[in-house]
């Protein structure tokens, strides 16, 4: 799996999980989240060569098509596969509220 | 939706469905498929600017992050959303066989 265990341990130009820390205030302009101040969002990036973690029949076909037609612009792309939620604390006036924001953290990637 | 109805009618630099015809023999080297000779596989391509058809909370966050941090390399990517199967005819010896290959045709795209 193209997850932290594999990607953060290997120098990988191909599609892999990349570390990205997002500071809510500085990077998103969000002042409303009290805790955490930021989080490890991560992101997916890198080349998708022939059959590198292809996720559907179509991406495998496209991968093969690119190998035979290297001048073609139709190639798979490195995107998130597994995502996890993030629990945040914010205030409604003086009242604290805990909320779970879905699909905020990328855990693994795929070529799609 | 970033589908044929929208994308094939508009000239769109941003993430959209693109037409792609694949000839099984010529483009994939597959000689085993008898019918069809090829099919409209389509593919997804184009830029994913700020919140253009972002598909998850993470891709929306990443999109906002890129707007505020334009020098960042962490940006969403244009990939397939809805896929459809393709029915093919091939032969095992002299015996014809009909098979449905799943996820062969891209019908719409998203920024992920």
């Amino acid at each position: 799996a193209l997850d932290a265990a594999y990607c953060f341990r290997n120098v990988q130009d191909n599609c892999c999980l990349r570390p990205l820390y997002i500071d809510f205030k500085r990077d998103l302009g969000w002042k409303w989240i009290h805790e955490p101040k930021g989080y490890n969002a991560n992101f997916c990036a890198g080349a998708c060569p022939y059959l590198w973690s292809s996720d559907t029949q179509h991406s495998r076909v496209l991968s093969l098509y690119n190998t035979i037609n290297p001048e073609a612009s139709a190639s798979p792309c490195c995107v998130s596969q597994d995502l996890e939620p993030l629990t945040i604390l914010y205030y409604i006036g003086k009242t604290p509220k805990i909320e779970q924001l879905s699909n905020m953290i990328v855990k693994s990637c795929k070529c799609s | 939706a970033l589908d044929a109805a929208y994308c094939f009618r508009n000239v769109q630099d941003n993430c959209c469905l693109r037409p792609l015809y694949i000839d099984f023999k010529r483009d994939l080297g597959w000689k085993w498929i008898h019918e069809p000779k090829g099919y409209n596989a389509n593919f997804c391509a184009g830029a994913c600017p700020y919140l253009w058809s972002s598909d998850t909370q993470h891709s929306r966050v990443l999109s906002l992050y890129n707007t505020i941090n334009p020098e960042a390399s962490a940006s969403p990517c244009c990939v397939s959303q809805d896929l459809e199967p393709l029915t093919i005819l091939y032969y095992i010896g002299k015996t014809p066989k009909i098979e449905q290959l799943s996820n062969m045709i891209v019908k719409s795209c998203k920024c992920s």
Epitope: L28, G29, W30, K31, W32, Y90, Y91, I92, G93, K94, T95, E99, L101 | L51, Q57, R60, V61, L64, T67, I68
Partner: antibody
Framework: QVLLVQSGADVRKPGASVKIFCKAS????????MHWVRQTPAQGFEWMGS????????TYARRFQGRLVLTADTSTNTAYMELRSLKSADTAVYYC?????????????WGQGSLVTVSS | DIVLTQPPSLSVNLGQTARITCRAS???????LAWYQQKPGQAPKLVTY???SRAPGIPDRFSGTNSGITATLTISGARAEDEADYYC?????????FGQGTKLEIK
């Protein structure tokens, strides 16, 4: 500069619904919380609720809960306020307003207002 | 809900100091109150917020204080263009509430 442009005046019958839009420009729409406030001569200003773009967290005043829906379309930088089961007492000028940053906060920019008249 | 009480009207001479008060039904803390100015046919305009912050573009003759229960908007050397309705707003608790407004007349 920051601009919040709202939809025009509307006349509705009792029991109907109204949907008002608020198109934002001049700032990063997804970074700020958007509020909806209405004003009537009888009640003055009444806060209706707020919505946080991207994460779609909506907070509603108790008295509007169940018939108010606040949404934000980040692709078009537009906030929407839909009020259902309208009564004549809902005749008011409706404003969208951006907050300084917190969920409940001072409102630094306001739309021009949308007059909604509920009459049979 | 927190109730905010303001005097319905206030009249001051041109160049004099105007003090508009806003009394809360319970303590807000010093940082949860804002003042708005509204002129006929216009949307409200933020004047002060928090403990004593002035909104951008607001002249320094406007100042706000807040003890927690009673907040005061002070206009030192009132001008003709300051004639308007002034509203206080609390954001310490949901729902946000507003005062009924004070009509300021400049004589």
């Amino acid at each position: 500069q920051v601009l919040l442009v709202q939809s025009g005046a509307d006349v509705r019958k009792p029991g109907a619904s109204v949907k008002i839009f608020c198109k934002a420009s001049g700032y990063t729409f997804s970074s700020n919380v958007m509020h909806w406030v209405r004003q009537t001569p009888a009640q003055g200003f009444e806060w209706m609720g707020s919505v946080i773009p991207i994460v779609d967290i909506a907070t509603y005043a108790r008295r509007f809960q169940g018939r108010l829906v606040l949404t934000a379309d980040t692709s078009t930088n537009t906030a929407y306020m839909e009020l259902r089961s309208l009564k004549s007492a809902d005749t008011a000028v409706y404003y969208c307003a951006r907050t300084l940053g917190l969920v409940l906060d001072a409102m630094d920019y306001w739309g021009q207002g949308s007059l909604v008249t509920v009459s049979s | 809900d927190i109730v905010l009480t303001q005097p319905p009207s206030l009249s001051v001479n041109l160049g004099q100091t105007a003090r508009i008060t806003c009394r809360a039904s319970q303590s807000l803390g010093s940082s949860y109150l804002a003042w708005y100015q509204q002129k006929p046919g216009q949307a409200p305009k933020l004047v002060t917020y928090g403990a004593s912050s002035r909104a951008p573009g607001i002249p320094d003759r406007f100042s706000g204080t807040n003890s927690g229960i009673t907040a005061t908007l002070t206009i030192s050397g009132a001008r003709a263009e300051d004639e308007a309705d002034y509203y206080c707003q609390q954001y310490a608790d949901s729902p946000i509430t507003f005062g009924q407004g004070t009509k300021l007349e400049i004589k």
